[in-house]
């Protein structure tokens, strides 16, 4: 079958090969499209409601005055010339619609280095088939799930027109000491080949470098974090920053379901409470900051406790709180 692409709303003429140029003609068009159940047969005589959708012209060609999504499918013509020789034409018709130029909405004017930021949402309206949206940084394609890049996509279809609206939300974590004015753009690539991509106007947010924070200190009492069963451990999170940030607590890397507090009192310690504890300070202007982790363990009477309960490094990395 010969592949034909036609723009939605435009006319389409399909030639019936081998058909005499004018009547009388022995030919038959068969259609299997979104408008038909199985095959529909059209003859030169025509007439009826189908004339508004597709009709056979005097030269045997099939004429569709305004192609729609439902006209996608197979079109076949079987014609016999004056000598009785049979010729078959076979077309696969696919339709398309180029959307309006994509746009970036809800774009950020400023990004913070070292933490995830929403850059903006790219929107393309009125495409068929759906096509795809992709993001570019300084002209180079951005690959989702690489180097702090994440993309959330959504595709919606208009209930009446059948055309697609695409949305793509870009989140990035700019590197510290990187480009202070990166250029982001988004492009729409049509689902059908041979149509060029459409690109948005670029956006150039500023990248703000937060001043490195003083380290979050975690103090454990009793020192070393070893306690007898049923004893109490007090963890204090000391943050030099003003105003005081919200302090949450982690155990074995998982958030503890507790109200925010700079002091964590662990009374009546039991075996289930052993593990590594850390605190996370969340500032309104900075990303979250984690303390070192301390190990809490139970010592049976007569045992000597460890001298230091610290594990891991500086704990200055950023992390997402559940």
């Amino acid at each position: 079958a010969q592949n034909i692409t036609a723009r939605i709303g435009e006319p389409l003429v399909l030639k019936c090969k081998g058909a005499p140029k004018k009547p009388p003609q022995r030919l038959e068009w068969k259609l299997n499209t979104g408008r038909t159940e199985a095959w529909k047969v059209l003859s030169p005589q025509g007439g009826g409601p189908w004339d508004s959708v597709a009709r056979v012209l005097p030269n045997g060609s099939l004429f569709l005055p305004a192609v729609g999504i439902q006209d996608e499918g197979i079109f076949r013509c079987q014609a016999m010339n004056r000598n009785g020789k049979e010729t078959k034409s076979n077309y696969r018709v696919r339709v398309y619609q180029i959307p309006g130029k994509p746009e970036i909405v809800d774009s950020a004017s400023e990004l913070t280095a070292g933490v995830p930021n929403k850059v903006g949402t790219c929107v393309s309206e009125g495409s068929y088939p759906a096509g795809t949206l992709s993001w570019h940084l300084d002209g180079k394609p951005l690959v989702p799930n690489e180097k702090g890049v994440s993309v959330k996509e959504q595709t919606r279809r208009h209930p009446e027109t059948g055309l697609f609206t695409l949305q793509s939300e870009l989140m990035v974590t700019p590197a510290r000491g990187g480009d202070p004015r990166p250029t982001f753009s988004c492009s729409f690539s049509p689902g059908l080949p041979r149509h060029r991509a459409l690109r948005t106007a670029p956006i150039q947010p500023r990248v703000w470098e937060p001043v490195p924070l003083e380290e979050v200190q975690l103090v454990v009492e009793p020192e070393g974090g070893a306690v007898a069963p049923g004893g109490t451990v007090t963890l204090t999170c000391e943050v030099p920053a003003q105003p005081s940030p919200q302090i949450h607590w982690m155990k074995d890397g998982v958030p503890l379901p507790l109200p925010p507090s700079p002091v964590l009192i662990l009374p009546e310690i039991g075996p289930q409470d052993q593990g590594t504890y850390s605190c996370v300070a969340t500032h309104s202007s900075h990303g979250p900051q984690e303390s070192r982790a301390v190990s809490i363990s139970i010592i049976e009477p007569g045992e000597e406790g460890p001298t230091a309960g610290s594990v891991g490094g500086s704990g200055l990395g950023t992390l997402a709180l559940a």
């Epitope: 049923g230 109490t232 919200q246 607590w249 958030p255 503890l256 379901p257 507790l258 109200p259 925010p260 507090s261 700079p262 002091v263 964590l264 009192i265 662990l266 009374p267 009546e268 310690i269 039991g270 289930q272 409470d273 559940a322």
Partner: antibody, heavy 120, light 107 residues
Amino acid sequence: QVQLQQSGAELVRPGTSVKVSCKASGYAFNNYLIEWIKQRPGQGLEWIGVINPGSGGTNHNEKFKVKATLTADKSSSTAYIQLSSLTSDDSAVYFCARSAGTARARFAYWGQGTLVTVSA
Amino acid sequence: DIQMTQSPSSLSASLGERVSLTCRASQDIGSSLNWLQQEPDGTIKRLIYATSSLDSGVPKRFSGSRSGSDYSLTISSLESEDFVDYYCLQYASFPFTFGSGTKLEIK
């Protein structure tokens, strides 16, 4: 011994608010958390939220974020829940419970409950 | 939110019988589960904490266990004061959630 003594039953009008208290004794009030739980007549239990009396920090069940305000007075070792814009759906028994960040202390002791009836 | 599906909702049993109540967690809660007992007058008492640890003063006939996402409270030999309501409670993550309860009735 640990005790959580709750205030008496309340009969209140729709649209008004009510404050239920939970007085703690027999332990260091600042070292533990107070959880609040709702039980409608003949129904199950629903967690409302928790307060750390030492820091004043709270966490709420999203469902009760607007409805319930949790506070604590360290000087009297008393925790409070204030319920606002009352409707018949708020008619229930409200419990306080003592908790902490350790397994052994989670919801270990319970108050006797306070019945709040909202009626015109 | 984590759903706690408790079964059965009611259970008729005889004195001396062994019974088990179950709660199924919709997400991983580790061992962060309590079993609570509620008397007809509304008094609530914790029986089991951290899935299987018995509270002090609670009779040894009560025990807690876990198999995957299913948590069980077993009473080895029912006594007359055991015919009350029981609830499970998960405290692994906010918001904490309870099972819908089991009413234990005397046959």
